[in-house]
């Protein structure tokens, strides 16, 4: 046993050494040697029969939600769902796994991040990667041409996530989509309005929604002299402009991706621009860009979009950004992404770099990929990055040391003397039947102090106290936990009084 303990200590020390060398950016050879030593030590350690066969943990990239975290999550979902419903959306659900074929060819390079399932009776299955492709499959399969729906569910990606930054392998997406043939830009404007409403309601800090259009990007690359084959790879370079300087992006395009310097410079003239409707107007006058049919269509639609956004009162939150180039695999028109201008960080606290918190766009060709005749159903939608939002909200609440209630109990049924368990059980049952959220302690003769303490800890606002005298008088003592003020309430009026005090509607409608 002592020998094993010594080896375990050496494995720990060697692990620390390797991490230290990596942090110090030591030579690759030295790191390689020390890693090899670590592996040899681990091999000598072998399995430990005396311990459990496995470490009890959740799989990489996943987490449990504690009651506190769930309370935060429910609040966030409540804001989102109320907004989706306010905009007249129906709700759907789809299987957590799809036929592998359904997901293939829809995500470009990201396809390698799809989780494939082991053979299930002959069907090749994969866990869903997002909610958009299953939605398109649902529309095609049910021959639907018109729906406004929301879908909140978990999706799965074999990513290497930075969980501290709100990234996971299993995470929720909250999607809202409008499918159907409508007049241009009205549904698109509503999606942006929804995005702004939700982000404002969540109070997670100031945000900006970057908007661009796939057709403008296509047209811009074409007039700058980028070959079709280089379009996607140049796109991915341009998309880095929110993180690195133009010089670095240009070096990558020229040095690594073989673009001519003059072509890169022409792209640079465009992609470094961002603004509002005036930039759209300016580009409509651009002698080259305005000659490109695709770009002209995109600019025309964006001009219209800005008109609607002004009417919706959100034009101040929107920035036309020519460097926005992400998620282009199935997008065909307008694309958008919401970013926090800064994450609210309290004094002495590291800001949480969570990046984009919502995104979306128009994808008119996706449903057609599933239709035997290739019939298209135009779609536009958005996705709220709730995991990132949970991280921000949790961090903010921790910083404020805010106590979050994890239950909704309105009243604790308590007793002041012994031998009153039966009376407590009768009363709590009456309250439950009347729709009151009530609890009692699971003890025959609990001390009154313990009962009051439980209320303090759980944030329960009221205590209904039964005593011998109160039973004789046909009253219940109703005590406010925070103010400690007590009043005698007639038993038949108790339900109404609790509802009045907790702001609950008097009838269960």
């Amino acid at each position: 046993m002592a020998e094993r303990a010594a080896l375990e200590e050496l494995v720990k020390l060697q692990g620390e050494r390797v991490r230290g060398l990596k942090q110090q950016k030591a030579s690759a050879e030295l790191i390689e040697e020390e890693v090899a030593k670590l592996l040899k030590l681990k091999a000598q350690l072998g399995p430990d029969e005396s311990k459990q066969k496995f470490v009890l943990k959740t799989p990489k990239g996943t987490r449990d939600y504690s009651p506190r975290q769930m309370a935060v999550r429910e609040k966030v979902f409540d804001v989102i769902i109320r907004c989706f419903k306010r905009h007249g959306a129906e709700v759907i659900d789809t299987p957590v796994f799809e036929l592998k074929e359904t997901l293939m060819g829809k995500y470009g390079e990201d396809s390698k991040l799809i989780y494939d399932l082991k053979d299930q009776g002959g069907e090749l299955l994969s866990l869903r990667y997002d909610l958009t492709v299953p939605f398109a499959r649902y529309l095609a399969m049910n021959k639907l041409t018109n729906i406004k729906r929301y879908h909140i569910a978990k999706v799965y990606r074999r990513d290497n996530p930075a969980m501290t930054r709100g990234r996971y392998r299993e995470f929720y997406q909250c999607d809202f989509d409008i499918a159907g043939n409508f007049d241009p830009m009205i549904p698109d404007a509503e999606c942006l309005k929804i995005m702004c409403e939700i982000l404002s309601s969540l109070q997670i800090g100031d945000f900006l929604v970057k908007v661009n259009d796939r057709r403008i990007l296509d047209g811009m690359f074409a007039i700058c002299g980028v070959s079709d084959s280089k379009f996607r790879t140049i796109c991915s370079s341009v998309d880095k402009l929110d993180k690195v300087s133009w010089e670095e992006v240009k070096n990558e395009m020229v040095g690594e991706k073989g673009l001519a310097p003059e072509v890169a410079d022409r792209i640079g003239d465009y992609v470094q621009q961002h603004g509002g409707v005036s930039l759209v107007e300016q580009l409509l006058q651009d002698p080259k860009l305005s000659q490109n049919k695709q770009a002209l269509e995109g600019l025309g639609d964006l001009k219209l979009l800005f008109e609607y956004l002004t009417l919706f009162g959100i034009d101040d939150k929107i920035s036309f950004d020519l460097s926005l180039a992400r998620g282009l695999d199935y997008y065909t028109g307008v694309i958008y992404e919401a970013v926090l201008l800064q994450t609210p960080a309290q004094a002495g606290e590291e800001p949480l770099g969570v990046g984009s918190v919502a995104a979306g766009g128009r994808y008119d060709g996706l449903v057609g990929m599933f239709d035997p005749k290739g019939r298209k159903v135009p779609c536009v939608g958005l996705s709220i990055g709730v995991e990132r939002i949970f991280s921000i909200v949790e961090q903010r609440l921790e910083a404020l040391e805010e106590k979050i209630r994890t239950t909704e109990t309105q009243v604790l049924v308590a007793s002041a003397q012994k031998k009153l368990l039966e009376e407590r059980l009768k009363l709590v049952s009456e309250l439950w039947d009347a729709g009151i959220k009530a609890e009692l302690l699971y003890k025959k003769n609990p001390k009154l102090l313990n009962q009051l303490q439980y209320c303090e800890e759980a944030g329960i606002p009221l205590v209904a106290i039964i005593g011998e005298q109160e039973l004789k008088d046909g009253v219940i003592k109703l005590r406010s936990v925070t103010s400690r003020e007590e009043v005698d309430v007639r038993r038949e009026d108790l339900v109404e009084e609790i509802k009045r005090r907790t702001g609950q509607p008097l009838c269960i409608c």
Partner: antibody, heavy 120, light 107 residues
């Protein structure tokens, strides 16, 4: 049982060369890092050089770098130290030792040592 | 290079005594430390590695402690065969260095 036996020491003039050998037995030689450590008469211990089990990695103390070469022959269970351009200050007992747990730079088994005297 | 400094350089004690030898590193070495015993004309013998792990076959009266820069070797009850020179050695980074030694003599 583990045994390490050094040989090849002796008297040599400054500037001369010498090759030390260490014959190993009682363990899987190729699994272990091996090292040469020396001790000048009446002085403390000095780590001279090491070599990994697969021959992939070696290193030397600054005092011998460029003059000494460590090598091993796993087929023969032997460790070597080729010493060139010897100096007076290289006079010492040279020990070969095996790393503890194959890769940890602590000698768990040592040979009895071989004396190298550099003198004119 | 990491310097290792032992104290005292020599110590006189009697059989049955408790003896403590100290070793300091010029920079933090975590628990990468070994203690050896060497008798005249013999090779050093490993007593302790990883600062506190007892090498198999070594009597339990020997113990090691410490981490970072400060380490101690303790012999709880001296036996006649324990009179020798003791060396500490860091195994954190090459060149692996030894202390100058502590000679334990009979009082």
């Amino acid at each position: 049982q583990v045994q390490l036996v050094e040989s090849g020491g002796g008297l040599v003039k400054p500037g001369g060369s010498l090759r030390l050998s260490c014959a190993a037995s009682g363990f899987t030689f190729s699994d272990y890092y091996m090292t040469w450590i020396r001790q000048a008469p009446g002085k403390g211990l000095e780590w001279v050089s090491y070599i990994s089990g697969s021959n992939a990695y070696t290193d030397y103390a600054d005092s011998v770098k460029g003059r000494f070469t460590i090598s091993r022959d796993n087929a023969k269970n032997s460790l070597y130290l080729q010493m060139n351009s010897l100096r007076d200050e290289d006079t010492a007992v040279y020990f070969c030792a095996r790393y503890v747990y194959q890769v940890v730079a602590i000698g768990d088994y040592w040979g009895q040592g071989t004396l190298v005297t550099v003198s004119s | 290079d990491i310097q290792m400094t032992q104290s005292p350089s020599s110590v006189s004690a009697s059989v049955g005594d408790r003896v403590t030898i100290t070793c300091r590193a010029s920079q933090g070495i975590s628990s990468w430390l070994a203690w050896y015993q060497q008798k005249p004309g013999r090779a050093p013998k490993l007593l302790i590695f990883a600062a506190s792990s007892l090498q198999s076959g070594v009597p339990s009266r020997f113990s090691g402690s410490g981490s970072g820069t400060h380490f101690t070797l303790t012999i709880s009850s001296l036996q006649p065969e324990d009179f020798a020179t003791y060396y500490c050695q860091q195994a954190k980074s090459f060149p692996y260095t030894f202390g100058q030694g502590t000679k334990l003599e009979i009082k």
